[in-house]
Amino acid sequence: TVPPMVNVTRSEASEGNITVTCRASSFYPRNIILTWRQDGVSLSHATQQWGDVLPDGNGTYQTWVATRICRGEEQRFTCYMEHSGNHSTHPVPS
């Protein structure tokens, strides 16, 4: 088992909004849960976009999930990752 490296980034979207993206890379096996939580509960799937789980050329995999949020409400969102029985949560950077 190779645990993922998780990285959260933010980018400007429309006025007053930002897109936050959570990327997991260099993990094996390929089964992974990567999702956004808002206010500690699940964020609707309809408001999230997922990338495919793709090989990254080193025998491991990578994927991402993104959502659009209101600027100033970053604290309310965390990216949750679960892989091979381990888990972690990742805040949006300031």
């Epitope: 206010d39 500690g40 509960v41 699940s42 409400e73 679960e82 888990h87 805040p91």
Partner: antibody, heavy 119, light 107 residues
Framework: DVQLQESGPGLVKPSQSLSLTCTVT?????????WNWIRQFPRNKLEWMGY???????NYNPSLKSRISITRDTSKNQFFLQLISVTTEDTATYYC????????????WGQGTLVTVSA | DIQMTQSPASLSASVGETVTITCRAS??????LAWYQQKQGKSPQLLVY???MLADGVPSRFSASGSGTQYSLKINSLQPEDFGSYYC?????????FGAGTKVEIK
Amino acid sequence: DVQLQESGPGLVKPSQSLSLTCTVTGYSITSDYAWNWIRQFPRNKLEWMGYINYSGTTNYNPSLKSRISITRDTSKNQFFLQLISVTTEDTATYYCSYYRYDGAWFPYWGQGTLVTVSA
Amino acid sequence: DIQMTQSPASLSASVGETVTITCRASGNIHNYLAWYQQKQGKSPQLLVYNAIMLADGVPSRFSASGSGTQYSLKINSLQPEDFGSYYCQHFWSFPLTFGAGTKVEIK
């Protein structure tokens, strides 16, 4: 360590308002987290009532929405529960707690305060 | 609302026995589940979060598992301090709801 302490009257008359205070020490309620009220009825059933978060946003259990208000006093690092038009069915032990945004579970609770609704 | 159904409502066990408590959600909660222990006259204490993760300081005789709508809490080699009530709680969506509890008593 975050510590929470509930306070308020132990006896309320039917049709009146129930008002409780949660005093938080060891952490500023404006820094982060969701600050919650949970109650436990005499037969031990637990009910999540609602929260006020670090920015003052509230979220209430729909079963209580018309009767509940959660507010705060940031200068005293306290948050409050008000429940109007109480009946004997509101007799319960009331707890304050908090959760972090990595998941809505409750790592620490106050010691609880029993409120009896009776004429 | 998601309803949480716990079983059994109560059980009697001896020190050293293994006990299992189950919790069923009325919909898929995708491992968004916590377990609490409550002793008489005390506040609930967090045991497990994210369905399987033991909270800080929880002894390794406790373990938890499950997925979808079915979850369980297992206590290996029950100790005197383990007697009390146990509650599950989902955090998939609002409102957050709890199971009705399982009371673990001394046989």
